[in-house]
């Protein structure tokens, strides 16, 4: 997999992984850490300053909207 992803490469990678539904650069509030004082981790920290994998990228995808009811 990639070593690190920064700038346009990171954006292209996120679009590829998430599709057109979009993505966050920071995890949504309340995502992951239970501590309110914990510094927010962003994708740049996780994938540009160090290497990350597909699973890590997927964590920053915007959620799917709920399926329409039958």
């Amino acid at each position: 997999g990639p070593e690190t992803l920064c700038g346009a490469e990171l954006v292209d990678a996120l679009q590829f992984v998430c599709g057109d539904r979009g993505f966050y650069f920071n995890k949504p509030t309340g995502y992951g850490s239970s501590s309110r004082r914990a510094p927010q981790t962003g994708i740049v920290d996780e994938c540009c300053f160090r290497s990350c994998d597909l699973r890590r990228l997927e964590m920053y995808c915007a959620p799917l909207k709920p399926a329409k009811s039958a």
């Epitope: 997999g1 990639p2 992803l5 346009a8 490469e9 954006v11 292209d12 990678a13 679009q15 590829f16 992984v17 998430c18 599709g19 057109d20 539904r21 597909l54 990228l57 995808c61 799917l64 909207k65 709920p66 399926a67 329409k68």
Partner: antibody, heavy 120, light 107 residues
């Protein structure tokens, strides 16, 4: 513009594997994401997975996870799709399809397709 | 996975007719739908992307509309070369999925 070139046909035995190639020429391989899409005879289109060749990021459809491997060789501008444990239901035309990076799934560029026939 | 349902599955029409093909998504996908044309023995060709944007080099008689879960491809005045199979595709979220196709035949 990039042209995607595929070989014509392969005949494989059930249980074997096939490796299909897709060579890009006449443009910048690095500016594309490559997906693999198959079409069984008389049927619709089915996305198998894709790769951004220069970044080495690969994403697979769950249906094919564990049975398909998508790779790319930057030095030859060639993408590959290997499908294992072939069965008769895998008989199909396998297309590589390119989308510009940032618009990975807008397939504005297609190979001519490789017909894979699985038969004993 | 997001299901894309196309209707009708086949359609007979005459040269000069205006035809519309509909595609419905199993969940809301904003405007992230593409339309392709495929002729026998050939690879698909991108006609419309992002629901309504015309791909470069494609005739302006093709147009796309819709958002959310319902999308349409319209051919304003059928030409002989338009008789083919048409597929919709969602790019909103992998796995990328396609409609089952609409075969457009000469009446």
């Amino acid at each position: 513009q990039v042209q995607l070139q595929q070989l014509g046909a392969e005949v494989k035995m059930p249980g074997s594997s096939v490796k299909v190639s897709c060579k890009a020429s006449g443009g910048t391989f690095s500016s594309y994401a490559i997906s693999w899409v198959r079409q069984a005879p008389g049927q619709g289109l089915e996305w198998m997975g894709g790769i951004i060749p220069t970044l080495g990021i690969v994403k697979y459809a769950q249906k094919f996870q564990g049975r398909v491997t998508i790779t790319a060789d930057k030095s030859t501008s060639t993408a590959y799709m290997e499908l294992s444990s072939l069965g008769s239901e895998d008989t199909a035309v396998y297309y590589c399809a390119g989308g510009p990076r940032g618009y990975s799934y807008n397939f504005d560029n297609w190979g001519q397709g490789t017909l894979v026939t699985v038969s004993s | 996975d997001i299901q894309m349902t196309q209707s009708p599955s086949s359609l007979s029409a005459s040269v000069g007719d205006r035809v519309t093909i509909v595609c419905r998504a199993s969940q809301t996908i904003s405007r992230y739908v593409n339309w392709y044309q495929q002729k026998p023995g050939k690879a698909p060709k991108l006609l419309i992307y992002a629901a309504s944007s015309l791909q470069s080099g494609v005739s302006s008689r093709f147009s796309g509309s819709g958002s959310g879960t319902e999308f349409a491809l319209t051919i304003s005045s059928l030409q002989p070369e338009d008789f083919a199979t048409y597929f919709c595709q969602q790019t909103y979220s992998p796995p990328i999925t396609f409609g089952q196709g609409t075969r457009l035949e000469i009446k």
